[in-house]
Interface confidence: low
């Protein structure tokens, strides 16, 4: 009498999350009579998939008909794949007795199961950062199988490179979850800028998934500070603006001080953008001359996006020959500036 | 003083192999987007090639497959691997820095002479 | 690619004077342009960028203006020292291209 075969063609089966798997089985004998039974997984903690004798297994059907005695296919098929389906099946050949003694099992056949990985969450950093410094921003996918994946960084199209990415966990599971944090250096002319996470798959058919974040929500610009004076008025009333140029975001506030004391406060609104995504802001204020016997120091302080106050100050001099001065004198154009205007 | 100053060019038979590298003085080379730009004799200026902060690489569509930028932070210098050369990249090579705010080109090193000819 | 095609192509024009460059994108590039001067055996210097704003060092009688797709350079009192050959660049997108150049030369 010929040894039984239980034979698995089949050593690996890949399926999409979702569709069915075919596992494959045929015996050589029919002899002796005992029922095939599946199991996912080997030794004493095996899980019963199907038993063709007998049992209610709602997921799974037999591929030809069991109860024919001349039947020597005992393959099966798993409806609605899930990555928790995912492992080694083995088929298991029985003789009939009491119990069931186990006779001969298949070689294996291990399922894998492709699950898209979920569409990339980007986020970037709590708070902004401004030009010239780093920011992270961190990319997640979730639920996908297998392991191997493909995760990209592009900033304005170009692929980045400071990028730290991790898969876990390291060994086998059902399914995977990666991260990926990429490292940003803001520019200034960054504010229309966009970062991509791209993320390749073999279920994606080379279609790959896309999260996206805008660097306008990670970069803050802050304002230059320009205070120039315009040429004395008949009236004797000086023209003094401040120029508030390139910042990002628009939440900006201006407070004119004449020596110290508040003038004015002016919250920025509705500002039309500039063609890098910054904004400009000017403010004037009018100063009479006449109406001071002292020197009028004046200051415009510009807070930002909640950072500190920067100021920029000079003093109109009150003079005995105020068609002397220049037409245009401007502050420098850092730090708390004072210019005398004559 | 900020200072670019480009060393490698000579005479290479076609086919040959040259590497050209640019060292940098008075700032901090990988804090720019740093370029290669060339000038056949006679001829215009031909951007070449370029390296971003992020290590992010471009080139030029002619020189791409034989041409590889790189830089080393530690020496504060940038490279050019320039192989499989031809005639027709005989040229001044010369190493310029992106500005930080635009990449608008602000500094350029002196050039460095290299000749492809048999 | 985009295209820079500078006019004229060489000009002839006297102490004093004043000369304007052309410069024209093949597509729009918003205001990333830049213009370069190159004398002979020199590397090219950089005098503007972003269309109109000047580097450091360079002297006011150089200006740039335009946006989009036409741009020009216009030295205000031609010195000996600035006849040479002038550059406009596009770097709004890879690969960065260069105008033909313009040979400014003494009349």
């Known amino acids: 009498e010929e040894e039984l075969q239980v034979i698995q063609p089949e050593k690996s089966v890949s399926v999409a999350a979702g569709d069915s798997a075919t596992l494959n089985c045929t015996v050589s004998s029919l002899i002796p009579v005992g029922p095939i039974q599946w199991f996912r997984g080997a030794g004493p903690g095996r899980e019963l998939i199907y038993n063709l004798k007998e049992g209610h297994f709602p997921r799974v059907t037999a591929v030809s008909d069991p109860t024919k005695r001349n039947n020597m296919d005992f393959s099966i098929r798993i409806s609605n794949i899930t990555p928790a389906d995912a492992g080694t099946y083995y088929c298991v050949k029985f003789r009939k007795g009491s119990p069931d003694v186990e006779l001969k099992s298949g070689a294996g056949t291990e399922l894998s199961v492709r699950a898209k990985p979920s569409a990339p969450v980007v986020s970037g950093p709590a708070v902004r950062a401004t030009a010239e410094h780093t920011v992270s921003f961190t990319c997640e996918s979730h639920g996908f199988s297998p392991r191997d994946i493909t995760l990209k960084w592009f900033k304005n199209g170009n692929e980045l490179s400071d990028v730290q990415t991790n898969v876990d966990p390291a060994g086998k599971s059902v399914s995977y979850s990666i991260r990926s944090t990429a490292r940003v250096l803001l520019t200034r002319r960054d504010v229309h800028s966009q970062v991509i996470c791209e993320v390749a798959h073999v279920t994606l058919q080379g279609d790959p998934l896309r999260g996206t974040a805008n660097l306008s929500e990670a970069i803050r610009v802050p304002p230059f500070l320009e205070v120039t004076q315009q040429s004395m008025r008949a009236d004797n009333q000086v023209n003094v603006t401040c120029q508030v140029t390139k910042f990002y975001p628009q939440r900006l506030q201006l407070t004119w001080l004449e020596n110290g004391n508040v003038s004015r406060t002016e919250m920025a609104s509705a500002l039309p953008e500039n063609k890098d995504g910054t904004y400009n802001w000017t403010s004037w204020l009018l100063v009479n001359v006449s109406a001071h016997r002292d020197d009028v120091k004046l200051t415009c302080q510009v807070e930002h996006d909640g950072q500190p106050a920067v100021n920029k100050s000079f003093s109109v001099k009150v003079s005995a020959h105020p068609k002397e001065q220049g037409s245009n004198t401007a502050a420098e154009n850092t730090g708390t500036n004072e210019r005398n205007i004559y | 003083e900020v200072q670019l100053v480009e060393s490698g060019g000579g005479l290479v038979q076609p086919g040959g192999s040259l590497r050209l590298s640019c060292a940098a003085s008075?700032?901090?080379?990988?804090?720019?987007?740093m370029h290669w730009v060339r000038q056949a004799p006679g001829k215009g200026l031909e951007w070449v090639s370029a390296i971003g902060t992020a290590g992010d690489t471009y080139y030029t569509g002619s020189v791409k497959g034989r041409f590889t930028i790189s830089r080393e932070n530690a020496k504060n210098s940038l490279y050019l691997q320039m192989n499989s050369l031809r005639a027709a990249d005989t040229a001044v090579y010369y190493c310029?820095?992106?500005?930080?705010?635009?990449?608008?080109?602000?500094?350029w090193g002196q050039g460095t002479m290299v000749t492809v000819s048999s | 690619d985009i295209q820079m095609t500078q006019s004229p192509s060489s000009l002839s024009a006297s102490v004093g004077d004043r000369v304007t460059i052309t410069c024209r994108a093949s597509?729009?590039?918003?205001?990333?342009a830049a213009w370069f001067q190159q004398k002979p055996g020199k590397a090219p210097k950089s005098l503007i960028y972003t269309a109109s704003s000047l580097h450091s060092g360079v002297p006011s009688k150089f200006s740039g203006s335009g946006s989009g797709t036409d741009f020009t350079l216009t030295i205000s009192s031609l010195q000996p020292e600035d006849f040479a050959t002038y550059y406009c660049?596009?770097?709004?997108?890879?690969?960065?291209?260069f105008g033909q150049g313009t040979k400014l030369e003494i009349k």
């Open positions: 660049q596009q770097y709004v997108s890879y690969p960065y291209t």
């Open positions: 597509q729009g590039i918003n205001n990333y």
């Open positions: 008075g700032f901090t080379l990988s804090s720019y987007d």
């Open positions: 310029v820095r992106g500005g930080v705010w635009d990449d608008a080109f602000d500094i």
